[in-house]
Amino acid sequence: RDKVMSEFNNNFRQQMENYPKNNHTASILDRMQADFKCCGAANYTDWEKIPSMSKNRVPDSCCINVTVGCGINFNEKAIHKEGCVEKIGGWLRKNVL
């Protein structure tokens, strides 16, 4: 179980790196973030560390109310601050693992 979670964490972070470059990856991550109401791997600040992402933005799928451009120059109160690895991991533990 721990190995699966560790793999999921690594994979999620790897996909974050590809987010700006790959539309398919972006749509998968967007779906996960929107569905699970989460942002980033550990938390939303992970997006700040992606070199090809602008420092003042997160994907729109992180927004509580998703609209085009809502992740630009974001306010913390307008986005999901919790990380996806923990949130989705909890769901996996409960329903799959």
Epitope: T45, S54, N56, G69, N73, F74, E76
Partner: antibody, heavy 119, light 108 residues
Framework: QVQLVESGGGLVKPGGSLRLSCAAS????????MNWIRQAPGKGLEWVSY????????YQADSVKGRFTISRDNAKNSLYLQMNSLRADDTAVYYC????????????WGQGTLVTVSS | DIQMTQSPSSLSASVGDRVTITCRAS??????LNWYQQKPGKAPRLLIY???SLQSGVPSRFSGGGSGTDFTLTISSLQPEDFATYYC??????????FGQGTRLEIK
Amino acid sequence: QVQLVESGGGLVKPGGSLRLSCAASGFTFTDYFMNWIRQAPGKGLEWVSYISNSGAIKYQADSVKGRFTISRDNAKNSLYLQMNSLRADDTAVYYCVRDPRSYYGFDYWGQGTLVTVSS
Amino acid sequence: DIQMTQSPSSLSASVGDRVTITCRASQSIRNFLNWYQQKPGKAPRLLIYAASSLQSGVPSRFSGGGSGTDFTLTISSLQPEDFATYYCQQSYSNPPITFGQGTRLEIK
């Protein structure tokens, strides 16, 4: 009503330090990013630093990087700017500025506090 | 970094005149453009946000336009209290947040 009151400015020698404070009232402090913006005498506006609602995100202008540190105390509704290794070109009025983010602009500014760096 | 260039840097006008100040960004900033008014010895005041939205309490003679890289601030009929310095500012790509160099509006 919204109020931002800066304090801590004054005359300091080059290489010295100063800590600016900003007391915020009349709004929910944690709903906003906060900024320091400065204006040298007779010059334009220059962004110095911002900090996110929780304090998790902080950025400084290149001109002050490694010398100035922004912080906030949400329990005290206060914003701070620790300024070290001050130089003559840091002489300016420093404004504490509220930032709703997105495309809304800097909607409230303090009255400013003057920092003079001179020997 | 995104550079903001205002023109003109100063202009003289009379009460009742229609005045337009322009601001150009070095790359597209969509509509993340704000305008401020500053009077001597005072803090700046937000006039227009999101390129064209009037901030609460600002007279309707002020209007903003544009998107992408080119923006305008228009004062339809100058009043004595409008003589001041005006700044544009972008928040689309930051840090750093950048301002134009300012436009000083003087009485002719």
